[in-house]
């Protein structure tokens, strides 16, 4: 998390800044949502605990052709220490239910806001 450059300013970005920018992007998505996000695409829900950023990316990376979440996908890749490819799921990612991308984004946003308030930037 020491090298999360490329989102708003060049060079390394502090974890708190990177998290705030991710939250802002998710807020932007939810507020600008007119038609169903990503045409109602469904993705695997995630456990919002350990390995959350990689798990979120593992779910969202499978959705292609949805410009609304492309920036979120890029930002999440900065939080995940390993490369994630479509169709790849770690052992931590329990695939037990699929939800619409819009709900996924809302759930993720609520959790990230909580982490930010608590000062958990990693």
């Amino acid at each position: 998390l020491t090298c999360l450059g490329g989102f708003a300013s060049p060079g390394p970005v502090p974890p708190s800044t990177a998290l705030r920018e991710l939250i802002e992007e998710l807020v932007n998505i939810t507020q600008n949502q007119k038609a169903p996000l990503c045409n109602g695409s469904m993705v695997w829900s995630i456990n919002l605990t350990a390995g959350m950023y990689c798990a979120a990316l593992e779910s969202l990376i499978n959705v292609s052709g949805c410009s609304a979440i492309e920036k979120t996908q890029r930002m999440l890749s900065g939080f995940c220490p390993h490369k994630v490819s479509a169709g790849q799921f770690s052992s931590l990612h329990v695939r037990d239910t699929k939800i619409e991308v819009a709900q996924f984004v809302k759930d993720l946003l609520l959790h990230l806001k909580k982490l930010f308030r608590e000062g958990q930037f990693n």
Epitope: P36, C38, N39, G40, S41, M42, V43, N62, V63, S64, G65, C66, G87
Partner: nanobody, 116 residues
Amino acid sequence: EVQLLESGGGLVQPGGSMRLSCAASGFTFRDYEMDWVRQAPGKGREWVSSIGPSGSETWYADSVKGRFTISRDNSKNTLYLQMNSLRAEDTAVYYCAKAYTGFGYWGQGTLVTVSS
């Protein structure tokens, strides 16, 4: 162009069985995870089940686990949903979907009504 055509719906009594089919065309069916999604009258869309490209991996919503079985025949480009022990709350329009694509790529759906 992706096309998905569901069939097999209808009226069935509680406790009965029904098998839905979905004929796929316009993409390499065997390469993709597939979903069944349903929408009950006046409700939102609910994920029912998914199956991996080869058919060896399957997943189910808790509400249908042990009652529904998803399967596929890649030689026929067809997806199936065997539904047993049907309940009134299973009444819905059932859609098959190419996973991770929006409802622009879903079929028109088939209505399943569970009623005595």
